[in-house]
């Protein structure tokens, strides 16, 4: 007679990442009896919600349920029905919603209320929707990549199971770039963290970690572009903005009201003698880089050293995983290889930005023009942020690893968030039982 497979004893969890530009739903799976082991949780599905970020629904809150339907339905299909009721669902909103809350707490609450009501309609165990702090976003991203890289495991291995593994327990730093904010998180070397706001203490798997983190609101790639435009239009002599961060021949009309819609441009706001202006691309990397540097105030630092805008940053230490838009942008530009030096990246960016817009459109016909037009800025911004903002050098550039996935799971804050909320990262090292670990590799 045929052997019948025993039903898998597995658990599932769902996290929705409500970012500034879009929402993604992640489904995670793990063996029920190994909940406290490190590295057992893995992503089985990512469903990117088709549409903008939830903060864009502020005037159409009643439609948030429609917007979320397809991916929630996908979760119903992927997760066995018998598991639905015990599958936790968490939604974390990041900087797009932080900005909306700055503008109007009432509107942000209304969006979250509708999100909660919509998600409560599904057969899962909905655990709430909230705006996570920048500190949490940085911390959970750091936990995610180190969990997936096996850095919390106490067992030393003679073989490498994951890329980037240096076969030691030195954790990786985390560099996260979104549309509206960017996070830097790492364990400094024997350095006191001079600003309490940037200090985190964790005890994970029996080991203490003193972690530095900071989230720069308004320094995600989309908001940084708005900042740059608002800064540059101040000194434009008329309604034409010749912009080195866009390809030669590129033209786009921008409404001044759109430019000043975000709290991120408030510091540059002024009364302009026109309602619209036209961006005309001139495609010059060096000038674009110079313009971006003006967004970083490096003239003031109340600590031993700073990143920018008076924010403490300890000396960089160890390897870093750069993910989310750091990865997507560099992947598009074909610059994620470990072998590409910082000088080569700069060289490639110079060439890319100088390419005529018509040529670019022909080469990348399948990419929406709005996104395609911004890769020159985004690539230049990444270089500026990493080199001048965070003080990476040509030498330390090789310690940055542009990471999309690790072991099939997306690098980002969502896995760390779920691990924390489901209490799956114990403070102490779990005792090995003969059943849960084999004696031999």
């Amino acid at each position: 007679t045929q052997n019948k497979a025993l039903p898998e004893n597995v658990k599932y969890g769902i996290v929705l990442d409500a970012g500034s530009s879009h929402t993604s739903l992640y489904i995670y799976k793990w063996p029920a009896e190994k909940e406290n082991d490190t590295g057992v949780v893995h992503q089985v599905e990512e469903c990117r919600v088709k549409g903008p970020g939830i903060s864009k629904f502020v005037q159409k809150v009643n439609e948030i349920g429609i917007y979320l339907t397809d991916c929630m339905e996908r979760a119903r299909e992927v997760i066995p029905r018998s598991q639905h009721q015990e599958t936790p669902v968490y939604l974390g909103a990041t900087a797009g919603m932080r900005l909306l809350r700055m503008e109007s707490e009432e509107l942000a609450d209304r969006v979250l209320d509708v999100v909660e009501r919509s998600l409560s309609n599904y057969p899962f165990d909905f655990q709430g929707a909230r705006i996570i702090t920048g500190q949490e976003e940085g911390a959970y991203g750091w936990i995610t990549i180190n969990y997936l890289l096996g850095k919390f495991s106490q067992k030393t291995r003679w073989f490498s199971i994951v890329p980037y593994e240096t076969n030691n327990q030195e954790t990786f730093g985390a560099l996260d770039l979104g549309g509206a904010s960017t996070q830097v998180t790492f364990v400094p070397q024997n350095q006191t963290i001079e600003s309490p706001d940037n200090a985190l203490q964790f005890r994970l798997y029996g080991k203490d970690y003193n972690v530095y983190t900071h989230s720069f609101l308004c320094y995600g790639k989309d908001q940084a572009l708005w900042q740059k435009l608002a800064k540059d239009i101040q000194v434009a002599s008329n309604e034409i903005l010749r912009d080195p961060c866009f390809h030669p021949g590129y033209k786009k009309v921008v409404n001044v009201s759109d430019l000043y819609k975000t709290p991120c441009t408030k510091r540059f706001e002024m009364t302009l003698p026109f309602q619209q202006f036209e961006i005309q691309g001139i495609g010059n990397y060096q000038q674009c880089h110079q313009s971006i540097l003006e967004l970083f105030n490096t003239s003031y630092c109340p600590y031993s050293q700073c990143a920018f805008n008076g924010i403490f940053l300890p000396p960089l230490q160890g390897d870093f995983g750069a993910f989310s838009a750091f990865y997507f942008v560099m992947k598009f530009l074909n610059l994620t290889s470990e072998k590409v030096s910082q000088e080569k990246v700069t060289e490639m960016m110079k060439k890319f930005c100088a390419q005529p817009w018509e040529e670019i459109k022909t080469s990348y016909a399948g990419v929406k023009e709005k996104y395609l037009s911004e890769y020159c800025f985004s690539g230049t911004y990444i270089l500026s942020l990493l080199l001048q903002g965070y003080h990476f050098t040509a030498d330390s550039w090789e310690h940055i690893h542009f990471i999309g996935k690790i072991q099939g799971s997306d690098a980002g804050w969502t896995l760390g968030y779920m691990l924390n909320l489901t209490n799956m990262i114990p403070a102490e090292q779990p005792l090995s039982t003969p059943l849960s670990h084999s004696t031999y590799v």
Partner: antibody, heavy 122, light 111 residues
Framework: EVQLQQSGAELVKPGASVKLSCIVS????????INWVKQRPEQGLEWIGR????????KYDPKFQGKATMTSDTSSNTAYLHLSSLTSDDSAVYYC???????????????WGQGTTLTVSS | DIVLTQSPASLAVSLGQRATISCRAS??????????MNWFQQKPGQPPKLLIY???NQGSGVPARFSGSGSGTDFSLNILPMEEVDAAMYFC?????????FGGGTKLEIK
């Protein structure tokens, strides 16, 4: 501007197969779902199915399962509908379409291809 | 499958007047607090065009004279005031469950 450009009219023999294409421009095909809809002369609309080009996931009307296969190629921003074992009942106009939210604003809009006329005749 | 029955099959309305088209589903098309009913317009030789989604929301660029209402199994599309360009076929469509289905259509003409 979002556009869906469908391949030209097809005249095929019964029993043969055909692959219709739908080239998307103005947005990334991965950022939407592509639906296929059949319309016979002077008749109503029939939904064949939908594909998510981001991951290849599909949903079909069971009556088109085995008859129709939807695929997509994200590198060329193109969706395809493959129809097999053709009979005169398959003679129709086939539309590709997207409807849903724009990826920048919360605007819900639709875009349709101009339709491909398929004639099955010996 | 969810069967959608449209009525009337054809309708003639004077310019400036109200046109009302009904659509009845064989079972509820509501789920998760949403009515998964859409309305499309089609003119001869053209592809359909989305007018209303989720029972009552206007598609982008759709004139305000088009409105939708209803929940559960009974839905209607209203056009007020009727204009010459509105003469067309109208189809209801449910996307609650696979297979998604369309109604048989209503031909709207000018009286």
């Amino acid at each position: 501007e979002v556009q869906l450009q469908q391949s030209g009219a097809e005249l095929v023999k019964p029993g043969a197969s055909v692959k219709l294409s739908c080239i998307v421009s103005g947005f990334n095909i991965k950022d939407t779902y592509i639906n296929w809809v059949k319309q016979r002369p002077e008749q109503g609309l029939e939904w064949i199915g939908r594909i998510d080009p981001a991951n290849g996931n599909t949903k079909y009307d069971p009556k088109f399962q085995g008859k129709a296969t939807m695929t997509s190629d994200t590198s060329s921003n193109t969706a395809y509908l493959h129809l097999s074992s053709l009979t005169s009942d398959d003679s129709a106009v086939y539309y590709c379409a997207r409807w849903g939210y724009d990826d920048e604003e919360a605007d819900y809009f639709d875009s349709w291809g101009q339709g491909t006329t398929l004639t099955v005749s010996s | 499958d969810i069967v959608l029955t449209q009525s009337p099959a054809s309708l003639a309305v004077s310019l400036g007047q109200r046109a009302t088209i009904s659509c009845r589903a064989s079972e509820s098309v509501d789920n998760y607090g949403i009515s998964f009913m859409n309305w499309f317009q089609q003119k001869p030789g053209q592809p359909p065009k989305l007018l209303i989604y989720a029972a009552s929301n206007q598609g982008s660029g759709v004139p305000a004279r088009f409105s939708g209402s209803g929940s559960g199994t009974d839905f209607s599309l209203n056009i007020l005031p009727m204009e010459e360009v509105d003469a067309a076929m109208y189809f209801c469509h449910q996307s609650k469950e696979v297979p998604w289905t369309f109604g048989g259509g209503t031909k709207l003409e000018i009286k």
